[in-house]
């Protein structure tokens, strides 16, 4: 997260760290007791490493009573996701067992009504992604509150030049933005999951290149079918 600040510890009990061989790779969001939603591209970077999900964490390195690392029983990328595009960039990870819920571990309600978030609405994005262009990684969860940008502006030739589909949304990226390592993490508006950080190799913190998020409401049928 660029230009953000340290999150209040455990105030985002839905927040997950998707890890490969014990290292943070992507963000994720607990959407059901045994399921974490993330970004499909995250798996590409996992190679043949051991994928696990850390829940109940604020610090990645320090011991915390609520922290627990779960093995992944199965990984379900969206069937239409492709390596060369950010379309359908969603991934569902089934944990090896149901998560032990508590104040620091709790699923987040996700948006089922397929309508756009109104431009100007402020939404929260959190993650353990890089906090500087030099690539500095934080140990503790960071967050930033960003205004949603209208799709027409986001699709301008000077911005994302038509790449933003109806199944995506954008947020302002003027010095404050999601970035590398935040992919798969949640964009939360008024206590409801609205978007998932896409995992393209987008430049971060440049206002002409707004943050891109996959709209979960657009994938309600797929999410429900996998979780069923």
């Amino acid at each position: 997260i660029l230009g953000g600040r340290e999150a209040e510890a455990h105030a985002r009990p839905y927040m997950a760290s998707v890890q490969v061989n014990g290292e943070h790779l992507c963000g994720g969001v607990l959407v059901a007791e045994q399921w974490v939603l993330s970004a499909a591209h995250c798996l590409e970077d996992a190679a043949d490493g051991k994928v696990q999900v850390l829940l109940g964490a604020h610090s990645l390195s320090q011991p915390e009573p609520s922290k627990r690392l779960y093995d992944v029983l199965r990984a379900v990328p969206h069937p239409d996701s492709r390596p060369d595009t950010i379309d359908h960039d969603l991934l569902l990870l089934q944990l090896s067992e149901k998560a032990t819920l508590g104040p620091a571990v709790r699923p987040l309600p996700w948006q089922r009504v397929d309508r756009d978030v109104e431009p100007g609405t402020l939404c929260d994005v959190a993650g353990w992604g890089i906090v500087s262009h030099a690539g500095r990684r934080p140990d503790r969860l960071q967050h930033v509150l960003l205004p949603v940008l209208d799709r027409a502006t986001c699709n301008r030739r000077t911005h994302h030049d038509g790449a933003i589909t109806q199944r995506m949304m954008c947020a302002e990226s003027n010095r404050r933005d999601s970035c590398k390592g935040d992919s798969g993490g949640p964009l939360v508006c008024g206590g409801v999951l609205e978007g998932v950080v896409t995992s393209g190799s987008r430049v971060c913190g440049n206002r002409k290149k707004p943050g891109i998020y996959t709209r979960v409401a657009s994938y309600a049928a797929w999410i429900d079918s996998v979780l069923a």
Partner: antibody, heavy 122, light 107 residues
């Protein structure tokens, strides 16, 4: 205790400009959006817009886009609003207010300045 | 722009009574709503955020409810310090418009 201290009342002539200030204390100025709100006597408040001191990003109500210019001075933790081409319609009390965070993604205007009265009269 | 319509515009009540103020949005605002109290010549004070949540320090006699386009603020057992004007404000898209207000007066 979080405080937003606004500058004093202003009496200005039609067509002139006025710059009002809002000095923040007891919190990290660059972490919170500062909003500006207009209120005419006996009427409900009107949201003018916000500025985020950490990036100087602004977002304005279209109605006030030409009228109000929002700026900040990080070094003094002060937000400013410049009102230009003033008319009698601009006579009002102007408030600055911090957008506070509650939990993970809830927010509202939690701390307000005392208000600055602007009177436009020849 | 989303319009916020408050009712009633004014209300004359006695200490100890219970009152409900309503706010109707011109479209669904998905609970992105706050309520404020304002005394004459003073700044607004936040009472409720996200339609139902009370910030620290707000007495529990205040409660917010509602969803979609219809929201209400209830004040149980009115105290003398509760008299003044009340406003709703939405945060769903911009501009973040306020309601026209409800003036609560002592009977």
């Amino acid at each position: 205790q979080v405080q937003l201290q606004q500058s004093g009342p202003e009496l200005v002539k039609p067509g002139a400009s006025v710059k009002i200030s809002c000095k923040a204390s007891a919190y990290t100025f660059t972490d919170y959006y500062i909003n500006w709100v207009k209120q005419r006597p006996g009427q409900g408040p009107e949201w003018i817009g916000w500025i985020f001191p950490g990036s100087n990003s602004t977002y304005s109500n279209e109605k006030f886009e030409v009228k109000a210019t929002l700026t900040v001075d990080e070094s003094s933790s002060t937000a400013y609003m410049l009102l230009s081409s003033l008319t009698s319609e601009d006579s009002a009390v102007y408030f600055c207010a911090r957008l506070g965070y509650f939990g993970s993604s809830y927010h509202a205007l939690d701390y307000w300045g005392q208000g600055t009265s602007v009177t436009v009269s020849s | 722009d989303i319009q916020m319509t408050q009712s009633p515009a004014s209300l004359s009540v006695s200490v100890g009574e219970t009152v409900t103020i309503t706010c109707r949005a011109s479209e669904n605002i998905y609970s992105h709503l706050a309520w404020f109290q304002q005394k004459q010549g003073k700044s607004p004070r936040l009472l409720v955020y996200s339609a139902t949540n009370l910030p620290d320090g707000v007495p529990s006699r205040f409660s917010g409810s509602g969803s979609g386009t219809q929201y209400s603020l209830k004040i149980n057992i009115l105290q003398s310090e509760d008299f003044g004007s009340y406003y709703c404000q939405h945060f769903w898209g911009t501009p973040w418009t306020f309601g026209g207000g409800t003036k609560l007066e002592i009977k």
